[in-house]
């Protein structure tokens, strides 16, 4: 969490941002809140990006003002106009690209004063893994697949019964480049699986950590998946 204050002039307002991660090819949110004002026409929101000459987005006098918008953001940004009055300056970003990563500044002017806060935005690809029993294999085998990751993640297998065991000798992980030539499909195979056990396939890079669990018993198979972003820090 980053909390910034206006430093020029006598009046300052609190602006709060939250570091976040964008999944490339999908929409992202750059979070920013501020002390609200009574009149929408008195609020100015400016989003800037370090190293970019033009603005990312500007909202003032109750409407978007994009004449100074940088070319890389054209047609890709929007504020939640109906929520500006209650202090939400968050920015929606369409079709996140790797190049959108960087340091952003949310700069606010209201009748109460000015304030700004920075936001670190990481970009990459992350997806939920699915673990299945591989019935085509000669021995009991589990197959963990996740369709989109970038940068290349690490894959670690764990088991509830054999806690702390190292499965690297009995697993094989491959990375297959997807058609857009950036993200990769992750496939990891675990051999010599025993029944009445719960296995976890953990995929992690510097942006996200995802886990796919499978419980294998004689009578049933239960699956569960979980994904967690690693860099959600507020400023």
């Amino acid at each position: 969490l980053i909390i910034g204050f206006g430093i020029s002039g006598r009046h300052s307002i609190t602006v709060t941002t939250v570091a976040s991660a964008g999944n490339i090819g999908e929409d992202g949110i750059l979070s920013c809140t501020f002390e609200p004002d009574i009149k929408l026409s008195d609020i100015v929101i400016q989003w800037l990006k370090e190293g970019v000459l033009g603005l990312v987005h500007e909202f003032k006098e109750g409407k978007d003002e994009l004449s100074e918008q940088d070319e890389m953001f054209r047609g890709r940004t929007a504020v939640f106009a109906d929520q500006v009055i209650v202090g939400n300056a968050s920015l929606r970003l369409k079709n996140v690209q790797l190049t959108d990563a960087g340091t952003y500044k949310c700069y606010i002017i209201t009748s109460k004063g000015k304030g700004n806060a920075n936001l670190e935005y990481k970009t990459g690809a992350f997806s939920m893994p699915e673990v299945n029993v591989d019935y085509n294999a000669s021995s009991e085998t589990l197959r963990c697949e996740a369709p989109r990751w970038f940068p290349q993640p690490t894959v670690v297998w764990a088991s509830q019964v054999d806690q702390g065991a190292n499965f690297s000798e009995v697993s094989n992980t491959s990375f297959e480049l997807n058609s857009e030539n950036v993200t990769m499909k992750v496939v990891s195979v675990l051999y010599n699986v025993t029944i009445n056990n719960t296995y976890s396939c953990m995929i992690e890079n510097d942006i996200a950590k995802a886990t796919g669990d499978i419980k294998v018993t004689e009578s049933e198979i239960k699956r569960r998946s979980h994904l967690q972003l690693l860099n959600s820090k507020a400023s």
């Epitope: 090819g25 999908e26 929409d27 033009g54 987005h57 409407k63 978007d64 003002e65 994009l66 004449s67 100074e68 918008q69 940088d70 070319e71 054209r74 047609g75 890709r76 940004t77 929007a78 929606r92 369409k94 079709n95």
Partner: antibody
């Protein structure tokens, strides 16, 4: 309310250029991009290009060599010019505005300019 | 270029029937699909944006759904005034593209 009004010729000689003006009201050209779309007789819609609030443009690659879109913010006018027209450019040409700055759909359309390319 | 394929090309329905129009994208377009109604001699009118958001003033019998590559426009109970061409389009990536349209006729 928001309106887009088109003006331009109905008949263009082969190999000549087409110029259409789209005059908007009810919103500022510094807030929204304006798209250009055409519809050939009995055919679907075809996106031609866009001019953004900043004045930057994006064109359909199929038309990039002969299409120019410009604007005058103070007059709330967008100018569409396509060169070297042929018979298969006969179509209704529309200007349109997005529903949001993030381009999720074209909410407001001009009345269309029927352009016939014929000698 | 992303190809938007609409089906069927045309259909004839009776008043009160449920109508389902399909639009398939050749690659992932997220939820950046919009649906338009075009009556003879008129400009297209926006019905649905962002795949499922009904535009202001559009009757609630029109519903959009889908994401990624498969999208649907449903008219829950078709009315005589729904006679029109229906177009889907994607605004996910350049060039923006449209389907070839579905002609809806009323029996």
């Amino acid at each position: 309310q928001i309106q887009l009004q088109q003006s331009g010729p109905g008949l263009v000689q082969p190999s000549q250029s087409l110029s259409i003006t789209c005059t908007v009201s009810g919103f500022s050209l510094t807030s929204y991009g304006v798209q250009w779309v055409r519809q050939s007789p009995g055919k679907g819609l075809e996106w031609l290009g866009v001019i953004w609030s900043s004045g930057n443009t994006d064109y359909n690659a199929a038309f990039i060599s002969r299409l120019t879109i410009t604007k005058d913010n103070s007059k709330s006018q967008i100018f569409f010019k396509m060169n070297s027209l042929q018979a298969d450019d006969t179509a209704i040409y529309y200007c349109a505005r997005d529903i949001t700055t993030i381009v999720e759909g074209f909410a407001y359309w001009g009345q269309g300019t029927l352009v016939t390319v014929s000698a | 270029n992303i190809v938007m394929t609409q089906s069927p090309k045309s259909m004839s329905m009776s008043v009160g029937e449920r109508v389902t129009l399909s639009c398939k994208a050749s690659e992932n377009v997220g939820t950046y699909v919009s649906w338009y109604q075009q009556k003879p001699e008129q400009s297209p009118k926006l019905l649905i944006y962002g795949a499922s958001n009904r535009y202001t003033g559009v009757p609630d019998r029109f519903t959009g759904s889908g994401s990624a590559t498969d999208f649907t426009l449903t008219i829950s109970s078709v009315q005589a005034e729904d006679l029109a061409d229906y177009h889907c389009g994607q605004t996910y990536s350049y060039p923006f593209t449209f389907g070839s349209g579905t002609k809806l006729e009323i029996k």
